[in-house]
């Protein structure tokens, strides 16, 4: 019997200061570039080593970015989302959704990764 995969979803406000080489990450997604099935949201696909996001440490690959400086990223074309980040100024506030995978064992059994054993 296989374990069930669940996800723990949390939201966080991350304030980044643009560094000498920018914010230091890549994105995928948009209404014209659906990276996740049935979801046109914007996702972090890469965090650049020693970039502003990496040095801050909170933004992770796979995070969904919900808004930039209070502006919702829903229903945006991919390039429009890119441009929004590029024009976001020196201090950039990101509302992000982290999705942590949680592996559960079969019912009645403790999962391998369960720390309470």
């Amino acid at each position: 019997m296989n374990g069930r995969v669940d996800y723990l979803v949390t939201e966080e406000e991350i304030n980044l200061t643009r560094g000498p080489s920018g914010l230091g990450f890549n994105i995928v997604g948009g209404t014209d570039q659906q990276y996740v099935s049935n979801d046109s949201g914007i996702y972090v696909s890469r965090i650049k080593e020693n970039g502003a996001a990496a040095l801050d440490g909170r933004l992770q690959e796979g995070d969904k970015i919900l808004s930039v400086n209070g502006q919702d990223l829903k229903n945006l074309l991919h390039q429009d989302a890119v441009d929004l980040f590029r024009n976001a100024g020196y201090a950039v506030s990101l509302r992000v959704q982290h999705r942590l995978q949680v592996q559960n064992g079969p019912i009645g059994h403790r999962g391998e990764g369960d720390p309470s054993g």
Partner: nanobody
Framework: HVQLVESGGGSVQAGGSLRLSCTAS????????MAWFRQAPGKEREFVAA??????YYADSVTGRFTISRDNAKNTVYLQMNSLKPEDTAVYYC?????????????????????WGQGTQVTVS
């Protein structure tokens, strides 16, 4: 992990043409930013051209002579090189990164790319 395989290099006379190909593994190829770099003996690796979701970018030295294009159905990016010059002689490398950088004008930086091919030699005499 993304694997890149280049082909199409060779020797050509000045003024001639070559077309390089780079085929990538991965099911989300259309989201990759793809680029070509080159390295001549004793020189730094140099940006040639890149293509992202939003368009193509070129080094000044190749603008008007080289054209980068992609076929997402074939997971392949091409570099059409026309009016070749002896100074174009180098090993040409294909590079890839998933997604688009949110930082302006970073497309020509080798540090922006996570995956690299083995390279293909181009010699112009």
């Amino acid at each position: 992990h993304v694997q890149l395989v280049e082909s199409g290099g060779g020797s050509v006379q000045a003024g001639g043409s070559l077309r390089l190909s780079c085929t990538a593994s991965g099911r989300t190829f259309s989201t990759y930013t793809m680029a070509w770099f080159r390295q001549a003996p004793g020189k730094e690796r140099e940006f040639v051209a890149a293509i992202s979701w939003s368009g193509a970018y070129y080094a000044d030295s190749v603008t008007g002579r080289f054209t980068i294009s992609r076929d997402n159905a074939k997971n392949t990016v091409y570099l059409q090189m026309n009016s070749l010059k002896p100074e174009d002689t180098a090993v040409y490398y294909c590079a890839a990164v998933i997604g688009s950088t949110v930082d302006s004008y970073r497309t020509g930086d080798p540090l922006e790319y996570d995956y690299w091919g083995q390279g293909t030699q181009v010699t112009v005499s």
